[in-house]
């Protein structure tokens, strides 16, 4: 730690006196203190001499000596009083800036320690301090206003009693700044705007902050707009509002509008887009395929996105057939608004029944006219299978009919023994029918196919099975010839995999 000579904490001298402060350290040392006139500084290796041969009240202050190379950062200090009978105060500042709830040090240094008993802090022109002003005094440092408030932003003077009269210092302006958490809060309404050419429009940009010192402006396509500003103060916040009113919009008013606000903490901006159109519009679209396939018994939500201006005057879902004249229940239709000009309409179809396949149309109307979007819903079914024995052109033939959607594939199996279903160990022969005959294929209905297996002689201790499958599931029918005649076996249960 550096050492100061003279080795006293305080030194009191008269104006005009010679003062020499010497600091010695292990390495190079440097002085720090209030910059003031008349000082001369001499450095010589590990010592530094601060001297004046004509001390003035302005030399009053605390002088600290530090050793920059010292890792412990030790320092030594001495306080110098230059007691000038005419100048009881050495004011080190014209202005003090602090944030609310910080301590504010008003640096009027007493030039004579004897005067400490009669000091006080006043506002300029002798006005008393504001109520609840909590302050303390240090002859080395000055007056400290504790936990300063914004309202205490005033001009202050330090007062000392000298020979029975009060002697004032020059004034110090205290600026207590509100703690600003960040850039001003912003709102820009509407978030999006569409107007038909010739209509009126309004865009409102507003910013608010705890501190009045902030700027706000509205710009259109990077051009700052000259708009009168309305100011207000409520809820302990300053508000500045810019309102752009357009009586008759035209295409040049379209584009990007940005509301920008800035303060010492930074800048905030928010944008919106203004679209000017020639006439009303109504657009319907869906992210879904308009041709839907769903397994019977499952559910489906049909969604339509609507973009419209002006707003919709009417909308509904309609079932166009072909199975019944039922209409979707209103409770299953749902509308959500994404924003002012975009909406989503959903029709929920839970646990679909065969009679609910067909066309569903969403219709909407606004001043631009009617629009419709139609979905085609086909239900998927697992195959249903039946087998009969018949003679075709004199030949014994097994005839398998399979019905389902999508179109089923057919496979014949011949296996030993009598069984409801051939398993691998029993299979004697397998025939794939790549092209079964399509008996019926109507939109929204099941597809029915027929496969023929010509059998010269029915083996009586064997089973003939027709199997059909599609993407939904599979079905089968076992045919067991018996001496008294043919016998057929549908499977024990209907094979259904939804």
């Amino acid at each position: 730690i550096p050492v100061i000579e003279p080795s006293v904490p305080e030194l009191v001298v008269k104006p005009g006196a010679t003062v020499t402060l010497r600091c010695v350290g292990n390495g190079s040392v440097e002085w720090d203190g209030p910059p003031s006139p008349h000082w001369t500084l001499y450095s010589d290796g590990s010592s530094s001499i601060l001297s004046t041969n004509n001390a003035t009240f302005q030399n009053t202050g605390t002088y600290r000596c530090t050793e920059p190379g010292d890792p412990l950062g030790g320092s030594a200090a001495i306080h110098l009083y230059v007691k000038d009978p005419a100048r009881p105060w050495n004011v080190l500042a014209q202005e003090v800036v602090v944030f609310e709830d910080q301590d504010a040090l008003l640096p009027c240094l007493l030039t004579d320690p004897v005067l400490e008993a009669g000091v006080s802090l006043v506002r300029v022109r002798g006005r008393p301090l504001m109520r609840h002003t909590n302050y303390s005094f240090s002859p080395w440092h000055g007056f400290t206003i504790h936990r300063a408030k914004f309202i205490q932003s005033q001009d202050y003077q330090c007062s000392a009693l000298m020979g029975g009269r009060k002697v004032m210092s020059i004034s110090i302006r205290l600026k207590v700044q509100k703690v600003i958490p960040g850039p001003p809060a912003l709102t820009l309404v509407p978030a999006e705007l569409v107007r038909i050419r010739g209509e009126a429009a309004q865009i409102v940009c507003s910013a608010s902050s705890v501190d009045v010192n902030f700027d706000v402006f509205l710009q259109h396509n990077n051009t700052k707009l000259a708009i009168p500003q309305q100011s207000d103060f409520h809820n302990n916040r300053y508000q500045k509002v810019l309102t752009l009113n357009l009586d008759q919009v035209d295409f040049q008013h379209a584009g990007n509008y940005s509301c920008v606000a800035s303060n010492v903490q930074g800048k905030h901006s928010t944008s919106m887009f203004f679209r000017v159109v020639e006439s009303a519009y109504l657009n319907l679209s869906s992210e879904q395929n308009l041709i839907q396939e769903v397994t019977v018994g499952e559910g489906l939500n049909l969604k339509v996105m609507v973009e419209a201006y002006p707003g919709l005057q009417g909308f509904n879902w309609t079932y166009l057939g072909p199975f019944s004249d039922h209409q979707p229940e209103p409770k299953l239709a749902n509308a959500t608004t994404k924003d002012t000009y975009r909406h989503t309409f959903t029709l929920s179809l839970p646990r679909l029944k065969p009679s609910e396949a067909g066309r569903y149309s969403f219709l909407a109307r606004n001043p631009g006219g009617w629009r419709a979007l139609t979905f085609e819903l086909t239900l998927r079914y697992p195959p249903e299978v039946s087998v009969i024995w018949t003679f075709i052109n004199g030949s014994g033939t097994l005839l398998c009919a399979a019905s389902g959607y999508p179109q089923p594939n057919v496979t014949w199996l011949q296996c030993s023994g009598h069984t409801d279903r051939c398993d691998e160990a029993q299979v004697l022969q397998v025939w794939d029918d790549p092209y079964p005959e399509v008996l019926s294929q109507e939109p929204f209905h099941k597809v029915t196919v027929q496969s023929l297996l010509t059998v010269e002689t029915l083996e009586h201790n064997q089973t003939y099975e027709c199997r059909a499958h599609n993407s939904v599931g599979s079905g089968s029918w076992a045919f067991i010839p018996i001496s008294a005649g043919a016998h057929t076996h549908p499977p024990d249960e209907f094979l259904f995999t939804p």
Epitope: E30, W31, D32, G33, P34, P35, S36, P37, H38, W39, T40, L41, Y42, L50, N54, Y63, R64, P68, G73, S75, L92, A93, Q94, E95, V96, V97, V98, Q102, A104, L105, P107, H141
Partner: antibody, heavy 117, light 110 residues
């Protein structure tokens, strides 16, 4: 070794406020006096003012009405704000530590601020 | 208009001695100490002389300062090409209650 670094926008529009920050590294900002000095292109140096770590400030009388300085000891930074700027405020702005005799050492490398619309 | 007056330019050949003057008044140089700064092209000023005649560590002893009355001067002996720079004098001014600078002298090494 104490080092200083100025930062802030290089372009300010007339009538707006110039804002600069000086970051002190390699040492503490506490217990020292910190100054701002400017130098218009091809001209001499002008002292703008100083701030102490307690928030006390002293300004050049010719600029006093437009200058505000502040200090943030937690960030080891001090700042300058110069309001209602004109083209005459176009200069390189330096921050520096002010010693007990009024000498400046060290200095930041300077930042050019242009006032133009 | 600067408070302290310096010649706008000075020149010398390598090895020569050059002196730069700085003139003030009783409120600045007359009653306070003088500091000198060197500003190399494109860089920030650097403290060259403080308290009239003291050199910070690292400054060659070719640079010296002096003060007499309301004037001060900076002398550079054994001039070198790297000394080509602008030189500014500065002093505390009692009426301003702050530091003032000279207008600067551009030194050219021929």
């Amino acid at each position: 070794q104490v080092q200083l670094q100025e930062s802030g926008p290089g372009l300010v529009k007339p009538s707006e406020t110039l804002s600069l920050t000086c970051t002190v590294s390699g040492g503490s900002i506490s217990s020292y006096y910190w100054s701002w000095i400017r130098q218009p292109a091809g001209k001499g140096l002008e002292w703008i003012g100083r701030i102490y770590t307690s928030g006390s400030t002293k300004y050049n009388p010719s600029l006093k009405s437009r200058v505000t300085m502040s200090v943030d000891t937690s960030k080891n930074q001090f700042s300058l704000k110069l309001s209602s700027v004109t083209a005459a405020d176009t200069a390189v702005y330096y921050c520096a530590r002010e010693g007990v005799t009024g000498g400046f050492d060290p200095w930041g490398q300077g930042t050019l601020v242009t006032v133009s619309s | 208009q600067s408070v302290l007056t310096q010649p706008p330019s000075a020149s010398g050949t390598p090895g020569q001695r050059v002196t730069i003057s700085c003139s003030g008044s009783s409120s600045n140089i007359g009653s306070n100490t003088v500091n000198w700064y060197q500003q190399l092209p494109g860089t920030a000023p650097k403290l060259l002389i403080y308290s009239n005649n003291q050199r910070p560590s690292g400054v060659p002893d070719r640079f010296s300062g002096s003060k007499s009355g309301t004037s001060a001067s900076l002398a550079i002996s054994g001039l070198q090409s790297e000394d080509e720079a602008d030189y500014y004098c500065a002093a505390w001014d009692d009426s301003l209650n702050g530091p003032v600078f000279g207008g600067g002298t551009k030194l050219t090494v021929l």
